[in-house]
């Protein structure tokens, strides 16, 4: 190969045009950074081949290595590739740009490396420094390559002066990787297989080039050897993998599989083990218990969760009152089954903003060709209690009655209480409970109805008061598992005129006389 002009180093002017010619006994090509350049190729009558590279409007970024090589360079000797280095001194370009691979320099041993900071002008003085350091380091510099030497794990920058300005290069990070220790990892495609299926295990070593693998496994103990396969993971430097493959597993292949790795240079070793289970046939097993009766609160969201183990992966279906459920487009129901480990699953039914109609009989069924399991429960929708009505009346019999009506699910309990001393109750005196004593002063009658369509209970309770001799605050409190509600009414003696405003003495109300209207007396509603 002949290059014209011959080089090996050329200094060209910025903005100029320059022609390079390469000729040889076979087709030749110009390359830069492993890329072919636009060029004109020709064949002369004397069977010599040439390629002409025209560099136009040169800038500092054209500084670098140019190679001429035979077009089909496989199997060529090193001297059948010619290198030319071109400088284009350009004051607008400081250091030539580097890609990330050049900025981060990883080492596996103590060896000479090059910090590739290059300038466009071979006359410039370049110095090497620790990043943010002023002292120049005594390391030799080659304008075509950079600083070469043995470097500690630090970050470095190069400096030069162009005209009257100091220019810094990017920082270069030198990082030494530890490769002496062996770290083995073992994993299996599956740790549970059915008999007749394959067992495949992989043992991986990172960061060591020369290692020996040894496998221990149940078959080996009975003298039936399996030949492992070793390969290199191409996209990962020095990741070496040994694969142990046992086709058509038998029940006796259950047990511990151990990969032992040794490297001969430093005589290090490591081993890791994994357990494999071979089952006769697939299985589905429920884990934990789900009560036969589940609850959800009206208008709240509720997630019902079933945990089970299965192999192979099952199909999971949910039913309500024997009809198949699916994710609803309105977002009222969401179904999901997650694989939380190799053989463990969590299936969830989420009811969003629960409605009364969603009460019913639910079933989850998980199955595959070998086994199935199902789990059922009744879902009850709990509705917080509401007092719907609290009214007072005085029938002709002379007694006074207070009627309280409310609803909720589960069935509400009703508690009647009264306050005689309006001044001090309920802050200072606890209200007295009514209706649960044998005294003749008050009688209680309670009826409970279950409304099928609304799926809730209605409680109607009537409190009969025999003789009321002073204003009495009567409270009806309804309670169930998900809430409570209460209302109060003030019952006044018969002797006070009712249809007009009532004058209650200051003794009753504490501190002052006060006119209380019928509305005041009858509507004290608490939640």
């Amino acid at each position: 190969l002949v290059i014209t002009p011959p080089g090996p180093e050329l200094i060209l002017n910025v903005s100029s045009t320059f022609v390079l010619t390469c000729s040889g006994s076979a087709p030749v090509v110009w390359e830069r950074m492993s890329q072919e350049l636009p060029q004109e190729m020709a064949k002369a009558q004397d069977n010599t081949f040439s390629s002409v590279l025209t560099l136009t409007n040169l800038t500092g970024l054209d500084t670098g290595e140019y190679f001429c090589t035979y077009n089909d360079s496989r199997g060529l000797e090193p001297d059948e590739r010619k290198r030319l280095y071109i400088f284009v001194p350009d004051p607008t370009v400081g250091f030539l740009p580097n890609d990330a691979e050049e900025l981060f320099i990883f080492l596996t041993e103590i060896t000479e490396i090059t910090i590739p900071c290059r300038v466009t002008d071979p006359q410039l003085v370049v110095t090497l420094h620790e990043k943010k350091g002023d002292i120049a380091l005594p390391v030799p510099y080659d304008h075509q390559r950079g600083f070469s030497g043995i470097f500690e794990d630090r970050s470095y920058i190069c400096k030069t002066t162009i005209g009257d300005r100091e220019v810094d290069s990017d920082a270069y990070y030198v990082y030494r990787l530890q490769v002496s220790s062996i770290n083995v990892s073992v994993n299996a495609v599956q740790t549970v297989v059915r008999q007749g299926e394959n067992i495949t295990l992989m043992c991986i070593v990172i960061g060591n080039e020369v290692v020996n693998f040894e496998w221990m496994y149940p078959r080996k103990e009975s003298g039936r050897l399996v030949e492992p396969v070793t390969d290199f993971l191409l996209d990962m430097p020095y990741h070496i993998r040994s694969i142990l493959h046992i086709p058509s597993a038998e029940l006796e292949d259950s047990g511990t599989y151990t990969c032992n790795v040794t490297e001969s240079v430093n005589d290090h070793q490591d081993e890791k083990a994994i357990n494999i289970t071979v089952v006769e046939s697939g299985y589905v097993r429920l884990l934990g218990e789900v009560g036969a009766l589940q609850f959800a609160e009206l208008h709240r969201s509720r997630t019902l969760q079933v945990v089970f183990e299965a192999y192979p992966p099952p199909t999971v279906l949910w039913f309500k009152d024997n009809r198949t459920l699916g994710d609803s487009s309105a977002g009222e129901i969401a179904l999901s089954t997650r694989n939380v480990s190799e053989t463990r699953y969590v299936s969830e039914l989420t009811l969003v903003r629960v409605k009364v109609a969603e009460a019913g009989h639910y079933t989850m069924r998980a199955f595959h060709e070998d086994a199935e399991v199902q789990l059922s429960f009744q879902l009850q929708i709990n509705v917080p209690v509401r007092v719907l009505e609290l009214s007072e009346s005085h029938p002709d019999s002379g007694e006074q009655t207070v009627r309280c009506r409310g609803r909720g699910m589960p069935q509400p309990n009703i508690i009647w209480s009264a306050c005689r001393d309006l001044k001090r109750c309920p802050r200072e005196l606890p209200p007295m409970l009514l209706g649960n004593s044998s005294e003749e002063e008050s009688q209680l009658e309670t009826n409970v109805t279950y409304w099928e369509e609304e799926q809730e209970f209605e409680v109607v309770s009537t409190l009969r008061l025999q003789h009321v001799d002073r204003p009495l605050s009567v409270r009806c409190t309804l309670r169930n598992a998900v809430g409570q509600d209460m209302q109060e009414v003030i019952v006044v003696p018969h002797s006070l005129p009712f249809k007009e405003q009532k004058l209650i003495s200051e003794e009753d109300l504490g501190g002052e006389q006060k006119l209380i209207s019928e509305e005041d007396l009858h509507h004290h509603h608490h939640h």
Epitope: A100, F104, D170, A171, Y175, L177, I206, M236, P237, H239
Partner: antibody
Amino acid sequence: EVQLVESGGGLVQPGGSLRLSCGASGFTFSSYWMTWVRQAPGKGLEWVGNINQDGSEKYSVDSVKGRFTISRDNAKNSLYLQMNRVRAEDTAVYYCSRDLVPPRQGDNYYYFGMDVWGLGTTVTVSS
Amino acid sequence: DIQMTQSPSTLSASVGDRVIITCRASQNINNWLAWYQQQPGKAPKLLIYEASSLESGVPSRFSGSGSGTEFTLTIGSLQPDDFATYYCQHYNSYSRTFGQGTKVDIK
């Protein structure tokens, strides 16, 4: 001198959009991952997102996913944060920084920190 | 998601004191941790990366240690410039997470 300068901050109404820019100088911009970090008034630092050298990999915090987009123009040495559908909680000083992420070594990755930061630009979301 | 918790939230100290700030990760993060210093009204500044590597130009009174879930930043002898807020930061290949910060103020 290695420098990052943010711009484009200002007052924006909730639901509105804003585009922040970060101009880089003094280093080979195209060789580095870049990151946006924000700091709400009186609060700590929060990573917003980052972008690799050629823009083919982008990652962001969940709270801005689908609303903010990070991009870069290596020819202009510029990093961008397009903020759409902004919320009051996006009010903060936004910093851009250089993220030192070396090429992966096998399945190992290394990280040398955010070593260069801009002075920040203030975004106020208010009606 | 991994949570980073710093303690204490505030620390009062005097010039010359030895100061230790702790950062805990909610799960094992190996040594994927950096420390930053932020002075009022300024941008953060990288101090430590990979849990214990000192960034160039950072005074040697700063040091980092720890791995797994527990990390510490130690300031050997507190200087006037060191009154600031310090943040730990976890990184992985797709995200970064900062601790809530530790403010070091004058006692």
